[in-house]
């Protein structure tokens, strides 16, 4: 309907216009993670606060069991930040056969699960080598992008090491999505 | 009105539809910060360019005195990048009682001020230890997420050390928000 | 039309309302870069996948020859992540005249080209010194912000060193834009 008149009143028009305020949206914030078993070679998923403080879900966007459930097909902007913290990682010191060793690393993956697909789809990955000498370290990884999702898709955030996630503040580690 | 007809012409409809082009939006860019006094234990706020170059405010989103003023309640996407730069931080050298010393760090906080609340709310925080040996260093911290804001809320960007902010280019350090 | 009735049916209204689903949008993903000549003092541009896997363009947003072509004036959210990877950069070791040498660095720039302007405009820059000792390293730079663009503007992503870009996975290095 861009740049043209509304159709005359005697003609009924099916319009995909919709109020912005009723679009599915969620912003989830970090909670302390309980250690859980996870599949070998699969990064563990974080679970989230969805109601308290800054966290919310609205307009049929629901959070359950580590997943954001997509209630409506469309293009979504999806984002997450995970702040990691750890002790000294003196990865420069130990070398095998004269080669630099494989560095320690931290990784965040935003993953889509579609029930009809056997494999999850990695939508976004942020991965960083960590070679901090001489002190405790902390740093965030931020991700965000737009994806075409289908009703019933599920989103989760996986991390390489759940024990390094900074769960102390809701503004440091978070996960969100909104229909564009 | 999603997926249904417009109401017949004899029936007047109150619709929360609105043109996307009239939504409050702002993109602010860095200017040189003048050293100013700030409260103890509170990170100083950055001030911003709001008109020149890439910067703009529109549709009643106003910038004044380091704050973006929210003109209308709703869900906003808020983002900022701050590029920091500094000199060698040889934090690996000094250890007390065999323990690694507390590292230098850089921090960005996007803060919401609501006049009716006594305390500001930290919406987003990016914080990173800095342990750079042997040369000057520079690096960005990026933040972005969606929040439900109320008319009259004020947003600002606080940093741990205003003297480390790279103010040289409008594309390196910036702050923005838009109503979804 | 916010918060007020639709005009009576006998009055035709020019409305800038439009279906969200028909807005120009694109999400591009990394492909292996072919080494190409680029102008001195100008960072090389990345080329992208625009159809396969997670990548798409829609609603007249077209990708051609390293550029996203803006089909309609308006405010766009633009984002990119580039994951870099490299070998040890022992930039703390070599000093000239007692001064630390200029550090290695990685840089991403999102650039706007307007045919009527002689010079490209740098919209966003993420730049980071790299001083990794003792192992291979990898890390992402993420950028995202809102800009007012004109029909016919072209967007590209430039990097400081194309040989350091991790092109192995579509979730690690990407570029997107959507009309708000």
């Amino acid at each position: 309907l861009k740049g043209q008149e509304f159709a005359p009143s005697h003609q009924q028009v099916y319009a995909p216009l919709r109020a912005d305020g009723d679009k599915p949206r969620a912003h989830l914030t970090v909670v302390r993670q309980t250690p859980t078993q996870h599949f070998k070679n699969q990064f563990p998923a974080l679970h989230w606060e969805h109601e308290l403080g800054l966290a919310f879900t609205k307009n049929r966007m629901n959070y359950t069991n580590k997943f954001l459930l997509i209630p409506e097909s469309g293009d979504y902007f999806i984002y997450s930040q995970v702040t990691f913290r750890g002790m000294t990682s003196e990865c420069s010191e130990i070398r095998q056969a004269g080669r630099p060793n494989k560095p320690d690393s931290i990784t965040v993956v935003i993953t889509k699960v579609t029930d009809s697909y056997p494999e999850p789809t990695q939508l976004l990955m942020g991965t960083k080598s960590v070679c901090e000498v001489g002190s405790n370290w902390f740093q965030p990884i931020y991700l965000g992008a737009m994806f075409s999702l289908q009703e019933g898709d599920k989103l989760m955030v996986n991390v390489s090491d759940i024990s390094l996630v900074d769960y102390t503040k809701e503004d440091k580690t978070f996960f969100g999505a909104f229909l564009l | 009105l999603k997926g249904q007809e417009f109401a017949p012409s004899h029936q007047q409809v109150y619709a929360p539809l609105r043109a996307d082009g009239d939504k409050p939006r702002a993109h602010l860019t860095v200017v040189r910060q003048t050293p100013t006094q700030h409260f103890k234990n509170q990170f100083p706020a950055l001030h911003w360019e709001h008109e020149l170059g890439l910067a703009f405010t529109k549709n009643r989103m106003n910038y004044t005195n380091k704050f973006l003023l929210i003109p209308e309640s709703g869900d906003y996407f808020i983002y900022s990048q701050v590029t920091f730069r500094g000199m060698t931080s040889e934090c690996s050298e000094i250890r007390q009682a065999g323990r690694p010393n507390k590292p230098d760090s850089i921090t960005v906080v996007i803060t919401k001020v609501t006049d009716s609340y006594p305390e500001p709310t930290q919406l987003l925080m990016g914080t990173k230890s800095v342990c750079e040996v042997g040369s000057n260093w520079f690096q960005p911290i990026y933040l972005g997420a969606m929040f439900s804001l109320q008319e009259g809320d004020k947003l600002m960007v606080n940093v741990s050390d205003i003297s480390l902010v790279d103010y040289t280019k409008e594309d390196k350090t910036f702050f923005g928000a838009f109503l979804l | 039309l916010k918060g007020q009735e639709f005009a009576p049916s006998h009055q035709q209204v020019y409305a800038p309302l439009r279906a969200d689903g028909d807005k120009p949008r694109a999400h591009l993903t990394v492909v292996r870069q072919t080494p190409t000549q680029h102008f001195k003092n100008q960072f090389p541009a990345l080329h992208w996948e625009h159809e396969l896997g997670l990548a798409f363009t829609k609603n007249r947003m077209n990708y051609t020859n390293k550029f996203l072509l803006i089909p309609e004036s308006g405010d766009y959210f633009i984002y990119s992540q580039v994951t870099f990877r490299g070998m040890t950069s022992e930039c703390s070791e070599i000093r000239q005249a007692g001064r630390p040498n200029k550090p290695d660095s990685i840089t991403v720039v999102i650039t706007k080209v307007t045919d009527s302007y002689p010079e490209p405009t740098q919209l966003l820059m993420g730049t980071k010194s790299v001083c990794e000792v003792g192992s291979n390293w990898f890390q992402p730079i993420y950028l995202g912000a809102m800009f007012s663009l004109q029909e016919g503007d072209k967007l590209m992503v430039n990097v400081s060193d194309i040989s350091l870009v991790d092109y192995t996975k579509e979730d690690k290095t990407f570029f997107g834009a959507f009309l708000l």
Epitope: - | R32, P35, Q37, M87, I162, S163 | -
Partner: antibody
Framework: ELQLQESGPGLVKPSETLSLTCAVS????????WAWIRQPPGKGLEWIGD???????SYNPSLKSRVTVSVDTSKNQFSLKLSSVTAADTAVYYC???????????WGQGTLVTVSS | DIQMTQSPATLSLSPGERATLSCRAS??????LAWYQQKPGQAPRLLIY???RRATGIPARFSGSGSGTDFTLTISSLQSEDFAVYYC?????????FGQGTKVEIK
């Protein structure tokens, strides 16, 4: 090599205008602010003011009415003009790079300007 | 303007000794304080910024501490090349101001 080099007359008459130029080499001129600082003989340091490549300036209020700092990016240099000088303006004048912000990590060698008739 | 007061005016010490220089601001400057070293006939040299961050290439024997109004520069073991005048500078407010200097001389 990173270098800042002041130049200008070493003697200025009272009530006239002191003019100095600082040439910057080996550094990205656009990435920093550039400052003037002076030091009267046997005394401490006084910040005069600074400028960036876009011509944005800030000045010490005590000197603001008499000071102009300007920039010529094509030559990678910036200049100081101090009007209506008196004997109290006799000093070694330094140009310096403002880095990290509001501190000065690279300095010229300084040039002594004497105000005398 | 914020006034910066350094003490003592002169410090007489022997090589190998520890030097402690003080700088006081007339009002709080948070940690926005720098220290410089100046030798006769030379330009000042940045030693410390941010009250405690060593500038590039500065030896570890130089350290800074303090916040608010009271700051200290410590030279853990004086070397012959350390005998010079030391200035503090605040950048917590404009105009930027310097102290009057402390001379560290050989006893």
């Amino acid at each position: 090599e990173l270098q800042l080099q002041e130049s200008g007359p070493g003697l200025v008459k009272p009530s006239e205008t002191l003019s100095l130029t600082c040439a910057v080499s080996g550094i990205s001129f656009n990435d920093f602010h550039w400052a003037w600082i002076r030091q009267p003989p046997g005394k401490g340091l006084e910040w005069i003011g600074d400028i960036n490549h876009r011509g944005h300036t800030s000045y010490n209020p005590s000197l603001k009415s008499r000071v102009t700092v300007s920039v010529d990016t094509s030559k990678n240099q910036f200049s100081l003009k101090l009007s209506s000088v008196t004997a109290a303006d006799t000093a070694v004048y330094y140009c310096a790079r403002d880095y990290p912000n509001f501190t000065f990590d690279l300095w010229g060698q300084g040039t002594l300007v004497t105000v005398s008739s | 303007d914020i006034q910066m007061t350094q003490s003592p005016a002169t410090l007489s010490l022997s090589p190998g000794e520890r030097a402690t220089l003080s700088c006081r601001a007339s009002q709080s400057v948070s940690t926005y304080l720098a220290w410089y070293q100046q030798k006769p006939g030379q330009a000042p040299r940045l030693l410390i910024y941010g009250a405690s961050r060593r500038a590039t290439g500065i030896p570890a024997r130089f350290s800074g501490s303090g916040s608010g109004t009271d700051f200290t520069l410590t030279i853990s073991s004086l070397q012959s090349e350390d005998f010079a005048v030391y200035y503090c500078q605040q950048y917590g407010d404009t105009p930027l101001t310097f102290g009057q200097g402390t001379k560290v001389e050989i006893k």
